[in-house]
Interface confidence: low
Amino acid sequence: AGVFELQIHSFGPGPGPGAPRSPCSARLPCRLFFRVCLKPGLSEEAAESPCALGAALSARGPVYTEQPGAPAPDLPLPDGLLQVPFRDAWPGTFSFIIETWREELGDQIGGPAWSLLARVAGRRRLAAGGPWARDIQRAGAWELRFSYRARCEPPAVGTACTRLCRPRSAPSRCGPGLRPCAPLEDECEAPLVCRAGCSPEHGFCEQPGECRCLEGWTGPLCTVPVSTSSCLSPRGPSSATTGCLVPGPGPCDGNPCANGGSCSETPRSFECTCPRGFYGLRCEVSGVTCADGPCFNGGLCVGGADPDSAYICHCPPGFQGSNCEKRVDRCSLQPCRNGGLCLDLGHALRCRCRAGFAGPRCEHDLDDCAGRACANGGTCVEGGGAHRCSCALGFGGRDCRERADPCAARPCAHGGRCYAHFSGLVCACAPGYMGARCEFPVHPDGASALPAAPPGLRPGDPQRYL
């Protein structure tokens, strides 16, 4: 569990010609507010799909009245962060939609009127617990600057908020096999063993032995895709084998979405999918035209010359959605295993594997040392999908190709002086010490700590280390 936090820094005219008209006037003062919608970026959803990770509305900003003749400045913003709590694991890849809304405060009949000023969208990769990420997005002539981060709620930690931390039972150390929880060094990572067989892709656990499913999956091991079409009756019994998901009375009962919008349940509430030309939490807002610049990412707006006619966005390659706000990203399906880098080349997906892995999807774990040569007599040491060379004396570097200074590590003990030699190093020992590294004290009676000194070797002689 955790919280996604969004900080809006500024909303105003973007660079370049064609500065937008101020959204407010002396006759119609207004104020801004923002809405954020988050979706996990692990599946190619329709652009209109619900905000499965959650959504949030900001407070209303200060009332603003345009100064006659002045260009539209950066507009006054609401205070505080937009916070979207998430109950399950943080997915790492997510898509967002941020909407800037105008609330007109004139003498409207029936209260203030809302209208959408701008809508930006994108897909990002973000680890929980990391620093604030900064972003700039443009919608038509408007520019939105914002920062965002995801943070875990205790006791969860980690980049996905799936590891748990618990206070230490002993003041000095964690239990066997358990690490301290950075940055909470006074706490220990809790042993977390999910139910045996729990799907690593679609399941996770917050308590040992459990298997909780990500949205869209069900069954005891989260291996069954949810399908509402397989139900015999709308309120029939649940079947884990067919993945029939049976809702009880829910937030969509009675359809809260206006103007022909369709309602979808979310883990916390509901989401309205609006027909073209309508926006808002319940599709209650209309009047968007091509003049409002509703098509993003270079989309071409057609139709919609007046508020009563719908517009259509023709999207450039690589984008989709009713407003071209969704980048087509096949790599979001994370097809590359074992940390491989996904490349979407248009005609094909390609995986670039980390060292030690191979195969079209990096699914083959190679012998780390296979085909790896360590130069100059070095030996290959396997470990963790990468290889390491243990180099012979006098050599260093990843493949033992670099000459090393054998004296750099100060190998001579007890004040002995080190000399580099073609076959290694030589230690000239200080009085009272002997041995290849001057490691043995010479006893006062002349006997050394060695079991037997090599014949002909006097204490203090340089010792060649071969």
Epitope: L343, L345, H347, A348, R352, G359, P360, L366, G371
Partner: antibody, heavy 116, light 107 residues
Framework: EVHLVESGGGLVQPGGSLRLSCAAS????????MTWVRQAPGKGLEWVAN????????YYVDSVKGRFTISRDNAKNSLYLQMNSLRAEDTALYYC?????????WGQGTLVTVSS | DIQMTQSPSTLSASVGDRVTITCRAS??????LAWYQQKPGKAPKFLIY???SLESGVPSRFSGSGSGTEFTLTISSLQPADFATYYC?????????FGQGTKVEIK
Amino acid sequence: EVHLVESGGGLVQPGGSLRLSCAASGFTFSSYWMTWVRQAPGKGLEWVANIKEDGSEKYYVDSVKGRFTISRDNAKNSLYLQMNSLRAEDTALYYCARDWGYFDYWGQGTLVTVSS
Amino acid sequence: DIQMTQSPSTLSASVGDRVTITCRASQSVSDWLAWYQQKPGKAPKFLIYRASSLESGVPSRFSGSGSGTEFTLTISSLQPADFATYYCQLYNSYSPTFGQGTKVEIK
């Protein structure tokens, strides 16, 4: 260690044919796309063709379509480029490379000279 | 097809200089860009992928940046081994496309 060694280059008359080979070692050849890149004398790099791991997809630069054929034999860890109807402008050093979209390992090249 | 244009074509510099090479795409290529180094008589050497990710074993004085249509390769402190020709390459299309190259020579 990854090794790619090209062979089969030489002097050929315009309209003639050559078959280039690339012997691969040090990696699981059948798990990688492979590509041919050429470089005319004193000029820059030009991608020529590439082929999927199992040979099921092949792509060519427009200037060689219909004349060159890329193929592979995974059992022999070998990549081939059959070049027909050769022209003077095909004169170049031909490299084979492991293909990630970008090319992380290259051979030393084999020279093809098309001249009468 | 997308065209890749490098500038300058030739660059004269001294050891220790900071060197910047620019590569422009005729339309946006996101960050699907690689950089290579080639010395006379040798095969190209792969340096950078995804515009800014350094291939393992490449010295950290090399860095890449940019996205969309404008990219740069920077050598923070030019070393004698760095005098070579550098190529950028687009790789998210059906036909991978190279820039025409930038030769870095001794001043």
